[in-house]
């Protein structure tokens, strides 16, 4: 039985060429966490293996840095940046927990932080 | 020298599921620190990388067919399988599976089973 | 999904020719891209990975060149073995995807 939540950032707003952390907590489980891929509608950015560490897509590596801890760091934001992101933790015994973030990456400077929620 | 070996049937019916297991001997999928892939080539046609597995179990899939595969991992018996569901025709292909170098780049898909021809007809 | 074009569909050539064979992406993959060596009834074979590096026990004839968007296979002087079909790989962003394809055939 899946018990484990996914506690995310939200939805996060940052702007223009600046940089943002993409941020997935999993808790109420005591699964060992084997894997998290990071993804961005149909592309994958980056996997952090429990065994192998952290490999990021060649596509991404200029704008893509690994953590802080299971994280993402997002840099040089473009608008094009703009949409959802999810976070896969592969876990066992439990099996898969995915949390939802939604970037939206703005012209102006002022770029506020949503609130966090969670992912049952 | 290691070597896979691809299982499974041969034909399978429009909307059922498709289960292939691959056999691999000549090493440890648990201590080799690879992923473990399946890649398919409709007959005539190129090649298209379906999903790869750790022996953990983590996986990561091509999104075109995310919604259908599920690929698992049993050390120990060294296999891996895959199954694709609500197949049609446009599955029937040669199924390969062959170990994945996603942390080791040079490797690419340096080692391949021989290939097993599924057919999906009523 | 970066998509990988092979020119020509077909080489007809003679042993002891030189074969050039071109793969062309969609939009950049740096350097990540390989090329697969396939004979009838036989899985792919890798040839060369990141764009000009021989895999293991691979004969010199073979080499890789190019980066960006345009890539060359050459066979410096085809062995009869080397008549088989060609895919350059892309690995730059996910999904990997092939190329359709090159078919070198005796002429």
């Known amino acids: 039985m899946m018990t484990g939540t996914i506690e995310t950032t939200g939805n996060i707003s940052a702007e223009k060429g600046g940089s943002i952390i993409l941020q997935c907590h999993l808790s109420s489980t005591t699964a060992q966490v084997t894997q998290v891929n990071w993804e961005q509608q149909d592309q994958l950015l980056a996997i952090c293996n429990a065994d192998l560490g952290w490999h990021i897509s060649p596509s991404f590596k200029d704008r893509v840095a690994p953590g802080p801890g299971l994280g993402l760091t997002l840099q040089s934001l473009t608008v094009n940046d703009t949409g959802e992101y999810f976070c896969i933790y592969h876990t066992y015994p439990d099996g898969t927990y995915t949390g939802r973030i939604f970037l939206e990456v703005l012209e102006s400077s002022v770029a506020e932080h949503g609130a966090r929620f969670q992912i049952p | 020298q290691l070597q896979l070996q691809e299982s499974g049937p041969g034909l399978v019916k429009p909307s059922e599921t498709l289960s292939l297991t691959c056999t691999v001997s000549?090493?440890?999928?648990?201590?080799?620190?690879?992923?473990w892939g399946w890649i398919r080539q409709p007959p005539g046609k190129g090649l298209e990388w379906i999903g790869s597995?750790?022996?953990?179990?983590?996986?990561y899939y091509n999104p075109s067919l995310k919604s259908r595969v599920t690929i698992s991992v049993d050390t120990s018996k060294n296999q891996f399988s895959l199954k694709l569901s609500s197949v049609t025709a446009a599955d029937t292909a040669v199924y390969y599976c062959?170990?994945?170098?996603?942390?080791?780049?040079?490797?690419?898909?340096?080692?391949w089973g021989q290939g097993t021809l599924v057919t999906v007809s009523s | 999904e970066i998509v990988l074009t092979q020119s020509p569909a077909t080489l007809s050539l003679s042993p002891g020719e030189r074969a050039t064979l071109s793969c062309r992406a969609s939009q950049s993959v740096s350097s990540y891209l390989a090329w697969y060596q396939q004979k009838p009834g036989q899985a792919p074979r890798l040839l060369i990975y990141?764009?000009?590096n021989r895999a293991t026990g691979i004969p010199a004839r073979f080499s890789g060149s190019g980066s960006g968007t345009d890539f060359t296979l050459t066979i410096s002087s085809l062995e009869p073995e080397d008549f088989a079909v060609y895919y350059c790989?892309?690995?730059?962003?996910?999904?990997?995807?092939f190329g359709g394809g090159t078919k070198v055939e005796i002429k």
């Open positions: 062959a170990r994945d170098g996603l942390y080791h780049t040079p490797e690419y898909f340096q080692h």
């Open positions: 990141d764009a000009s």
């Open positions: 597995i750790y022996y953990s179990g983590s996986t």
């Open positions: 790989q892309q690995r730059f962003a996910h999904p990997y995807t």
């Open positions: 000549g090493g440890s999928i648990s201590s080799s620190r690879y992923y």
